[in-house]
């Protein structure tokens, strides 16, 4: 809290300009009118106020708008946004995508790093949450904006939150946006992607759906195996184990095409390991890869789950 002191003669601010950066904190408090600051917020970001000076400016706005800032002020917060807490932001009503973009831009880290932050900071997460709740769903434009700033944004949402993503928004998702998603998230996103890309032809469809396949069921993998897609091993290793287990050796061979040779290098890792254990050794031998661990010849495989279902 900055104590109240009279403004020195001749220092009263008539407008927000560069001269103010030379004001001490107490002078900013005493000489800058909160209403003037609010009406000239667009100028604040053009002036390199220090982090400590921003404390004073925030304090003035907080006094002027105890119930939360209007969007006309929020839009021009610039670096002042770095001073906002999640509690401050929960008082806001942000409806404009331009406002959201402006604040995300400020928060980009301002380091000359090619690496975008994977997850938003708490105040940014609160801002996004307020914005998305206000819109009612994660529409394509919003998703476009958010994933551009935070490639890992989608994967920071819960499966419940992801359910509000309309299939049309899936077009905005890039493969790298799904890098950190877990199977539960992909389970929600995959059906949306399948719906979004359903009118594409075989090879184009596979290119688009590939990064979502960690949520695909067995029957969809079987269908893909009939389309000469040549799935790479990295994608195969991300498939759900329960979806891979029922696939036959012939189906996996068709699914992977020339990449089938890569199974040897992955034979100790899931889902390949578990899949090998379910296949007849005779069938595995037909691949000529030296995969071991299949069911020996002459053994009978009982599908207990089927038996339970019948009883």
């Amino acid at each position: 809290e900055v104590e109240k002191t009279a403004c020195p003669s001749g220092k009263k601010a008539r407008e927000i300009d560069e001269s103010l950066i030379f004001y001490k904190k107490w002078e900013l408090e005493a000489c800058v009118d909160a209403a003037l600051l609010a009406t000239q917020m667009d100028r604040v970001n053009a002036i390199p106020f220090t982090y400590e000076q921003l404390d004073v400016l925030k304090h003035k706005l907080d006094e002027l708008y105890p119930q939360g800032y209007p969007e006309s002020v929020i839009q021009h917060l610039g670096y002042l946004f770095l001073k906002m807490s999640p509690e401050d932001i929960r008082k806001w009503n942000v409806t404009s995508l331009e406002t959201l973009k402006a604040l995300l831009e400020v928060n980009k880290g301002h380091e000359m790093s090619p690496q975008a932050p994977r997850r938003p900071l708490p105040q940014v997460a609160t801002l996004i949450d307020r914005f998305v709740k206000g819109r009612g769903q994660l529409d394509k434009d919003t998703l476009d904006t958010l994933t551009a700033f935070y490639p890992g944004y989608l994967c920071s949402l819960s499966p419940e939150e992801l359910s509000s993503v309309p299939p049309s928004s899936i077009w905005a998702v890039r493969p790298q946006d799904l890098d950190t998603c877990d199977p539960r998230q992909l389970d929600v996103l995959y059906p949306k992607a399948r719906l979004a890309f359903q009118n594409m032809n075989g090879s184009e469809y596979f290119v688009k759906i590939q990064s979502f396949l960690g949520g695909a069921p067995t029957e969809d993998l079987k269908a893909l195996s009939q389309q000469n897609v040549s799935m790479d091993l990295a994608t195969f290793m991300k498939l759900r184990t329960d979806a891979v287990l029922p696939l036959t050796v012939a189906e996996v061979q068709k699914l992977l095409g020339p990449h089938v040779e890569g199974l040897k290098a992955e034979e100790r890792h899931r889902p390949v390991r578990d899949w090998i254990l379910r296949q007849r050794q005779d069938d595995l031998d037909t691949l000529g890869l030296g995969l071991q661990g299949g069911i020996p010849n002459g053994y009978l495989v009982l599908d207990l789950s089927m038996q339970e279902a019948l009883s």
Partner: antibody
Framework: QVQLQQSGAELVKPGASLKLSCKAS????????MHWVRQAPGQGLEWIGA????????IYYQKFKSRFTITVDKSTSTAYMQLSSLTSEDTAVYYC?????????????WGQGTTVTVSS | DIVMTQSSSFMSASVGDRVSITCKAS??????LAWYQQKPGQSPKLLIY???TRQTGVPDRFSGSGSGTDFTLTISSVQSEDVATYFC?????????FGQGTKLEIK
């Protein structure tokens, strides 16, 4: 990577004027404030002023405001500082430097410096 | 203006020694303080900011501490390549001001 390439050493007479240059590369020139700092022989560092290339907004330390002028040429990503009415007190190495986050004005990247000698 | 004072203009140490360089501000600057290293014939290089945050790529033998008016840069085990002049800078308010520098030499 970020580079700030400054013009070569200068020897001038008292009362003369001089224009120093600083060519930036490896980043978006219009995104960051460009500052100038000087260092007299065997002395500490002294902040002079800065310019934002996008808006042409400038700020100066009061003691330099009347004699030093900072400008930019966006088309060549170059910042300039014009020095006038030079005296022997202005003999120093002049550095350009950029600050990535203006609210945290630490000098993230520096030019190699231009040596200015004012002598009759 | 905030005046930054580095009481020692010169320090001497042996390789492996622990060295502390101090800096005092004439007014409270919180933790808005940076440290720079300037090797002979080179430009300054940012080492520490926010009084104690190491810049990316700076060896962990360098550390900073302090807040308010009193600050310290510590080199836990001096190496021969640490021969340089070290400056502090406050960025709490404009004009930005620096200390006069402390020159470190190896015995």
């Amino acid at each position: 990577q970020v580079q700030l390439q400054q013009s070569g050493a200068e020897l001038v007479k008292p009362g003369a004027s001089l224009k120093l240059s600083c060519k930036a590369s490896g980043y978006t020139f219009t995104s960051y404030w460009m500052h100038w700092v000087r260092q007299a022989p065997g002395q500490g560092l002294e902040w002079i002023g800065a310019i934002h290339p996008n808006s042409d907004n400038t700020i100066y330390y009061q003691k330099f405001k009347s004699r030093f002028t900072i400008t930019v040429d966006k088309s060549t990503s170059t910042a300039y500082m014009q020095l006038s009415s030079l005296t022997s007190e202005d003999t120093a190495v002049y550095y350009c430097a950029i600050i990535i986050t203006p609210v945290v004005p630490k000098f993230d990247y520096w030019g190699q410096g231009t040596t200015v000698t004012v002598s009759s | 203006d905030i005046v930054m004072t580095q009481s020692s203009s010169f320090m001497s140490a042996s390789v492996g020694d622990r060295v502390s360089i101090t800096c005092k501000a004439s007014h409270d600057v919180g933790t808005s303080l940076a440290w720079y290293q300037q090797k002979p014939g080179q430009s300054p290089k940012l080492l520490i900011y926010w009084a104690s945050t190491r810049q990316t790529g700076v060896p962990d033998r360098f550390s900073g501490s302090g807040s308010g008016t009193d600050f310290t840069l510590t080199i836990s085990s001096v190496q021969s390549e640490d021969v340089a002049t070290y400056f502090c800078q406050q960025y709490s308010s404009y004009p930005l001001t620096f200390g006069q520098g402390t020159k470190l030499e190896i015995k």
